[in-house]
C-alpha cells in the first residue's frame, strides 16, 4: 500500500503480485465518518490507474475488475470528489504483474587456479518482472551441501567462496540453481563436476627465453605453472605477424625447446596450461613474453648493378649499386659491405668496407678486365659475394632489346615492354631494366634503380621510388655471358602540361641567321617527360598570328637556330615546352633585330 | 578470548521443532563462520550447517537439509541460530556450536575449528 490511508482502504484480490493474463479485483472503501461532509449520499469515489480515470461509483464503496496489466508494477488510486472542493486522495496500492521464473539453463561453475574459489554462472531465461531470488547450491562428498543466495535484481552470477582441493580429485560435486518468485520457482538441471573438470589453472608467469651461445637453432623457453598442470600449449609468431605457430606439450616442467625459430626476428611468446588430458579447461594465455632471437650469418647474395662512365683516354668511372639483403636473408644488423675489385689479368685486387651506403665509386684505368666482389656482413659472418665481370654494356648493338615503349599503369607504375634483339633472341640470358629521375647535365648522384627479368619476358612493371609527373630515363639490357647490349627510352606514371616554358637567355645572330640559347625547366616543374620545345616569333606591334618552330626535345639541348627572319625588323619570341598532356604557358620574351642583309 | 555459550535443546516428540542459539561473548563475532556440529552416543562429531561470517554462504548436511535452517544476527545480539523442524530420532545427540575463520570454505581440510561451545543436549523421543 502506499500514503497513510487515514480515510480508506484500497484492497486488491486475489493477490498485490499477479501473473501477467490474470484478473484482479480492486475494492476502494470508506472508512466511517469520512465521506463528504453532510452529503454523504454524494460521495463520488474514483479509481485512477496512474493518472488515468478508470472506474467511478457514488456511495462508501468502489468495485472495480481490472484485466490485461502489462509487465511490470501499475499504481492504483482511489480519490473522492465532494461538491465545491477538490478531489482528495484516499489511498492506494501498487500491482505487480510478473511471470514465475523459467528453468535456469547452461548452469556452469569453474575455479580459477588451485587457490582460487567456486564460482557458477547460468543464464537466467526471460525477465520475470518481479524480485526473483536466485539459490545456488553445491552439493560434495562427505554429504553436504553449500548454499549461497543471491539477492541483485539481475543474478546470473555467485562465487562461493569455497576452494575445492585436489586431495580427492575424483570426488564428485554437483551444483544446482533454484530461482523462487512470489509466482512460483524453477531449479536448474544439476551440473555435476570433479575438482580437475572446473579448475581452470591460473596462465602461466614467469616466462623467459633462453639461447646456449647465442645461436637460435639451440633455444629454451621457461615459464612456472601451479603444482598439478599436466599440459601446455605454446604459441608464438613474429612480432609483425597475425599467425600464430602452435606447439602442444606433455609433462614439460616448465621448459621446452623450440627449434624453427628465425634468427635476429623479434617473437611475441605465450603459453597456456590445463590439468588433465580431456578433462577441465585450458587457462588464459600468460602475459606475452616478447624477445629477439640472435643473428645469424646472412644467406642469400647481393643483387648488384653497375655504371660506366668515360672520364678521358686512359680512365673511366665505376658506380657499383646494390640491393639490401632482405630481413630474412640479412639474419641480422648488416655491419658492413665489402667490396672488392680485382683486375683479372693482372691480379691487383682492393678491398674496400662500405658502412651506412649502398654504392660505390671508384675510378679505373680503361684498359684490363676488370671483376668485382660485393658481400654483406653482419656480427656472425658475411654472405656469399656476388661477382660481375666489368663490361661495356651496351657495345653489342645486335643484342640492343627493340621496340622498347613505357607506358603509365597505374597510380606511381610504369610498365615497360620490349621485343627481343634480333640476333639470337636464345642468347639472351637475361634483361636488366633500369630506370633513374632525368636530370638534364646526367647528374651521377641520381639515385638508380633497376630490376631483373627472366630471358623469355618482354615486359616489366617498375614501381619502386615512381614518383608521378616526373620523367625516367629507362634503359632495357640485354645480358649475354660477357656482352651487353642497350635500349632507352623516357618515360613518366603520370603527367600534365609544364608549369612553365623554357627561359631564352641568349640570342645570337650567325651569318643571316639566329641561335636561340634556353635554360631548362626546372624539373619540378617538367610534370612529366618534355616531348617538344616550340619556339614562337612574330613582328613587334603585328597583331598576325605568329610563327612557331618545333623541336623535338633531347636530354642534351638547349640551343637552335632559325634562318627565316627579316633583316632589320624587330621580332619577339618565346617559347613553350609540351608534354603528353599538353604545353606550358609562355616562358620569357625576348626581343631581336637582325641586323644582316636581305636575301 | 572468545567464548561461545549454547542454549535451546531439550526433549521433543518427533515431528516436533526446536531452535537453538548460541551467542559469543567476544567482539569478534562478524569475522567468524559459524556451525553447528552433533555427536550422537557411540559416533564421530559430525557437521550439522554453518553460515559464514557475511551471513552470505551457508552449508548443511544432506541429512538435514530441508528441516534445518541456520541463520545469525550480527548486529546486535552476536548470536547464531539453528531453526530445526520435523524432527527425527535420529537427530538426538549434543549439539556444539562452534566459531572459525575458514569454517564453511575449508570443510574438507582438517582442524578449521577454532573455538567450541560445551554443547547442549536435543532428544527427540516419543
Known amino acids: 500500500k502506499i500514503d497513510a490511508c487515514k480515510r480508506g482502504d484500497v484492497t486488491v484480490k486475489p493477490s498485490h503480485v499477479i501473473l501477467l493474463g490474470s484478473t484482479v479485483n480492486i475494492t476502494c472503501s470508506l472508512k466511517p465518518r469520512q465521506g463528504c461532509f453532510h452529503y454523504s449520499r454524494r460521495n463520488k469515489l474514483i479509481l485512477y490507474k496512474f493518472d488515468r480515470r478508470i472506474n467511478f461509483h457514488h456511495g462508501h464503496s468502489l468495485n472495480s475488475q481490472v484485466t490485461g496489466l502489462p509487465l511490470g508494477t501499475t499504481l492504483f488510486v482511489c480519490k473522492l470528489a465532494c461538491i465545491n472542493s477538490d478531489e482528495i486522495q484516499i489511498c492506494g496500492a501498487e500491482i505487480f504483474v510478473g511471470v514465475a521464473p523459467e528453468q535456469p539453463q547452461n548452469l556452469s561453475c569453474i575455479q580459477k587456479g588451485e587457490q582460487g574459489t567456486v564460482a557458477c554462472t547460468w543464464e537466467r531465461g526471460r525477465d520475470t518482472h518481479l524480485y526473483t531470488e536466485y539459490t545456488l547450491q553445491l552439493s560434495g562428498p562427505k554429504n553436504l551441501t553449500w548454499q549461497k543466495q543471491c539477492k541483485d535484481i539481475y543474478c546470473d552470477y555467485l562465487d562461493f567462496g569455497i576452494n575445492l582441493t585436489p586431495e580427492s580429485p575424483e570426488s564428485n560435486f554437483t551444483a544446482k540453481v533454484t530461482a523462487v518468485n512470489s509466482l512460483g520457482s524453477s531449479s536448474s538441471l544439476p551440473s555435476t563436476f570433479t575438482f580437475l573438470d572446473i579448475v581452470r589453472p591460473l596462465p602461466p608467469w614467469d616466462i623467459r627465453i633462453k639461447f646456449q651461445k647465442a645461436s637460435v637453432s639451440r633455444c629454451t623457453l621457461y615459464w612456472r605453472d601451479e603444482g598439478l598442470v599436466l599440459l601446455n600449449r605454446l604459441r608464438y609468431r613474429p612480432s609483425n605477424s597475425r599467425l600464430w605457430n602452435m606447439v602442444n606439450v606433455t609433462k614439460a616442467k616448465g621448459r621446452h625447446d623450440l627449434l624453427d625459430l628465425k634468427p635476429f626476428t623479434e617473437y611475441e611468446f605465450q603459453i597456456s596450461s590445463k590439468l588433465h588430458l580431456y578433462k577441465g579447461s585450458w587457462s588464459d594465455w600468460s602475459e606475452s613474453l616478447r624477445a629477439q632471437t640472435p643473428e645469424e650469418e646472412p644467406t642469400g647474395m647481393l643483387d648488384v648493378w653497375y655504371m660506366k662512365r668515360h672520364i678521358d683516354y686512359s680512365r673511366q668511372q665505376i658506380s657499383l649499386f646494390w640491393k639490401n639483403l632482405s630481413v630474412s636473408e640479412a639474419r641480422g644488423k648488416i655491419l658492413h659491405y665489402q667490396v672488392t675489385l680485382q683486375e683479372l689479368t693482372g691480379g691487383k685486387a682492393m678491398t674496400q668496407n662500405i658502412t651506412g651506403h649502398t654504392s660505390w665509386t671508384t675510378v679505373i684505368p680503361r684498359t684490363g678486365n676488370w671483376a668485382v666482389a660485393v658481400s654483406a656482413a653482419n656480427s656472425k659472418g658475411s654472405s656469399l659475394p656476388t661477382r660481375i665481370n666489368i663490361m661495356n654494356l651496351c657495345e653489342a648493338g645486335l643484342l640492343a632489346p627493340r621496340q622498347v615503349s613505357a607506358n603509365s599503369e597505374g597510380m606511381d607504375n610504369i610498365l615497360v615492354t620490349w621485343q627481343p634483339p634480333r640476333k639470337d633472341p636464345s642468347a639472351v640470358q637475361e634483361y636488366v631494366v633500369e630506370w633513374r629521375e632525368l636530370h638534364p647535365g646526367g647528374d651521377t648522384q641520381v639515385p638508380l634503380n633497376w630490376l631483373r627479368s627472366r630471358p623469355y619476358n618482354v615486359s616489366a612493371l617498375i614501381s619502386e621510388n615512381i614518383k608521378s609527373y616526373i620523367c625516367y630515363e629507362i634503359r632495357v639490357y640485354a645480358l649475354s655471358g660477357d656482352q651487353g647490349g642497350c635500349s632507352s627510352i623516357l618515360g613518366n606514371s603520370k603527367h600534365k602540361a609544364p608549369l612553365s616554358g623554357p627561359h631564352i637567355n641568349a640570342i645570337t645572330e650567325e651569318k643571316g641567321s639566329i641561335l636561340i640559347s634556353w635554360n631548362s625547366i626546372p624539373v619540378q616543374e617538367q610534370m612529366g617527360c618534355l616531348l617538344h620545345y616550340r619556339i614562337y616569333w612574330k613582328e613587334r606591334d603585328s597583331n598576325s598570328q605568329p610563327q612557331l618552330c618545333e623541336i623535338p626535345y633531347r636530354v642534351s639541348q638547349n640551343s637552335h637556330p632559325i634562318n627565316s627572319l627579316q633583316p632589320r625588323v624587330t621580332y619577339v619570341l618565346w617559347m613553350t615546352a609540351l608534354t603528353a598532356a599538353g604545353e606550358s604557358s609562355h616562358g620569357n620574351e625576348r626581343e631581336f633585330c637582325l641586323q644582316g642583309k636581305a636575301n | 578470548q572468545v567464548q561461545l555459550q549454547e542454549s535451546g535443546g531439550g526433549l521433543v516428540q518427533p515431528g516436533g521443532s526446536l531452535r537453538l542459539s548460541c551467542v559469543e561473548s567476544g567482539r569478534t563475532f562478524t569475522v567468524y563462520d559459524m556451525g553447528w556440529f552433533r555427536q550422537a552416543p557411540g559416533k564421530e562429531r559430525e557437521i550439522v550447517a554453518a553460515?559464514?561470517?557475511?551471513?552470505?554462504?551457508?552449508?548443511y548436511q544432506d541429512s538435514v537439509k530441508g528441516r534445518f535452517t541456520i541463520s545469525r544476527d550480527n548486529d546486535a545480539k552476536n548470536t547464531v541460530y539453528l531453526q530445526m523442524n520435523s524432527l527425527k530420532p535420529e537427530d538426538t545427540a549434543v549439539y556444539y556450536c562452534?566459531?572459525?575463520?575458514?569454517?564453511?570454505?575449508?570443510?574438507?581440510?582438517?582442524?578449521?575449528?577454532?573455538?567450541w561451545g560445551q554443547g547442549t543436549q536435543v532428544t527427540v523421543s516419543s
Open positions: 553460515i559464514s561470517a557475511d551471513g552470505a554462504t551457508s552449508i
Open positions: 562452534a566459531a572459525g575463520r575458514s569454517l564453511i570454505y575449508n570443510l574438507y581440510r582438517a582442524n578449521n575449528t577454532d573455538y
